[in-house]
């Protein structure tokens, strides 16, 4: 990164937390699933959100940790091992596998801080990489060489 | 969010920026594309990263803005309008559409700050939602009701 001059929030501690709360991945995406109208099943719907119309359909699973920022993360979970047939939208096609697309999300864990003499002094944020699944993708199986 | 006690970074201004730099979506994902081995084309490869094996293959396009945090964002760009046939991996099947999966990424823009009397006083971060495409997904076309 190029160097940026320091910015000017009024309270550094609160700002760090505030920014973090808002800068993380807001999944589920723009078009929310409507579970009552689109029951979770191994089929590709002809309407509804992208994750239910996909031939590698998926649902979102909440991962909540009150000692982590963001406290709420959503993981995609594939509803089928294979892809759904484009012909019918309901039968599976064994020529394709439904695979998760991952990324490493940076998260921050709340940890007790220790002062200069080892005394407990509030909480610090500890940065960690955390694997999150974004979606399921229909792929041709790998050819074993 | 539940209330967290304030945390204890040493310098608030630097910490805000440091946390932001690290908390955004690190795309391209875990398995990097190798463009020389897998030329970008409308076909589903039998090896390589997920975005080249997908029947809705995509490439990543860099979006760099030095006045934004994160400065680098990557957008998925579909390589085919339709899905690639699972039978061959090399010709299109018009029964399926290759659609982008979007999410609203929170970004922060660097803006000049103004002091109490309107004087220029360094830079502030302005939070904005920014639409990013994560991947391409093979979907059954919507049925128009």
């Amino acid at each position: 990164y190029s160097h940026w001059p320091s910015c000017c929030p009024s309270k550094g501690q609160d700002t760090s937390e505030e920014l973090l709360r808002w800068s993380t991945v807001p999944v589920p995406p723009l078009e929310p699933a409507r579970p009552n109208r689109h029951p979770e099943s191994c089929r590709a719907s002809e309407d509804g959100p992208l994750n239910s119309r996909a031939i590698s359909p998926w649902r979102y699973e909440l991962d909540r940790d009150l000692n982590r920022l963001p406290q709420d993360l959503y993981h995609a979970r594939c509803l089928c091992p294979h892809c759904v047939s484009l012909q019918t939208g309901s039968h599976m096609d064994p020529r394709g596998n439904s695979e998760l697309l991952y990324h490493n999300q940076t998260v921050f864990y709340r940890r007790p801080c220790h002062g200069e003499k080892g005394t407990h002094k509030g909480y610090c944020l500890e940065r960690r990489l955390y694997r999150v699944s974004l979606a399921c993708v229909c792929v041709r199986p790998r050819v074993m060489g | 969010y539940s209330h967290w006690p304030s945390c204890c970074p040493s310098k608030g201004q630097d910490t805000s920026e440091e946390l932001l730099r690290w908390s955004t979506v690190p795309v391209p994902p875990l398995e990097p594309a190798r463009p020389n081995r897998h030329p970008e084309s409308c076909r589903a490869s039998e090896d390589g990263p997920l975005n080249s094996r997908a029947i809705s293959p995509w490439r990543y396009e860099l979006d760099r803005d030095l006045n934004r945090l994160p400065q680098d964002l990557y957008h998925a760009r579909c390589l085919c309008p339709h899905c690639v046939s699972l039978q061959t991996g090399s010709h299109m099947d018009p029964r399926g559409n290759s659609e982008l999966l979007y999410h609203n990424q929170t970004v922060f823009y660097r803006r000049p700050c103004h002091g109490e009397k309107g004087t220029h006083k360094g830079y502030c971060l302005e939070r904005r939602l920014y639409r990013v495409s994560l991947a391409c997904v093979c979907v059954r076309p919507r049925v128009m009701g």
Epitope: S85, D93 | H91
Partner: antibody
């Protein structure tokens, strides 16, 4: 009735490139997929790869690094190039057509008569 | 790749008798979406190219005598010649067109006993 005819040199030296052409008569090369298949003496059939009229190709992974198939729609022909040949590439080489029905490729029909290519110095 | 295995490698049958050739695929070639088996049978006479006999595992190509029939589903298939004729002496191949790379069985040679 569509007919296919292979042509090209019957003898190729080791490490050189085998080049064959298939001429399609009695019909257009468009709207179909065109394959090369080979058969070593006394052996079974091995699919090499296919091309469609637009030039989209698909190769057998076992030969992919050495194969190029191209099409010339103006001449109603498609061609095979196989480089770095060895004695193991000695075979009868056939061209054949595949129809596409409901967006999927089907069986091979018809086939060319085949041409024997011998790899020898 | 889908591996196709034929048995027997060769078969000697008396004229007018039944000849049966088996073909197994390493994975199913039945597509449940259209309930079709992506399997074809070819006949190859000496010095000639293969000639299509049967497709979709059981549909005879036009002009193929009805003594030839195909059966089976999923991963196990059979080609039957109900009453062998002299002109049926040939090598027979099964082939899957379920997914690339297209693959053939190693062939079954049918002779007259």
């Amino acid at each position: 009735q569509v007919q296919l005819q292979e042509s090209g040199p019957g003898l190729v030296k080791p490490s050189e490139t085998l080049s064959l052409t298939c001429t399609v008569s009695g019909g257009s090369i468009s709207s179909y997929f065109w394959s090369w298949i080979r058969q070593a003496p006394g052996k079974g059939l091995e699919w090499i790869g296919f091309i469609d009229y637009s030039g989209s190709t698909n190769y057998n992974p076992s030969l992919k690094s050495r194969v190029t198939i191209s099409v010339d729609t103006s001449k109603n022909q498609f061609s095979l190039k196989l480089n770095s040949v060895t004695a193991a590439d000695t075979a009868v080489y056939y061209c054949a057509r595949q129809e596409i029905i409901n967006f999927e490729l089907n069986w091979f029909d018809p086939w060319g008569q085949g041409t024997l290519v011998t790899v020898s110095s | 790749d889908i591996v196709m295995t034929q048995s027997p490698a060769s078969l000697a049958v008396s004229l007018g008798e039944r000849a049966t050739i088996n073909c197994k695929s390493s994975q199913s070639v039945l597509y449940s979406s259209n309930n079709k088996n992506y399997l074809a049978w070819y006949q190859q006479k000496p010095g000639q190219p293969p000639n299509l006999l049967i497709y979709w595992s059981s549909t005879r190509d036009s002009g193929v005598p009805d003594r030839f029939s195909g059966s089976g589903s999923g991963a196990d298939f059979t080609l039957t010649i109900s009453s062998l004729q002299a002109e049926d002496v040939a090598v027979y191949y099964c082939q899957q067109y379920f997914s690339t790379p297209w693959t053939f069985g190693q062939g079954t040679k049918v002779e007259i006993k």
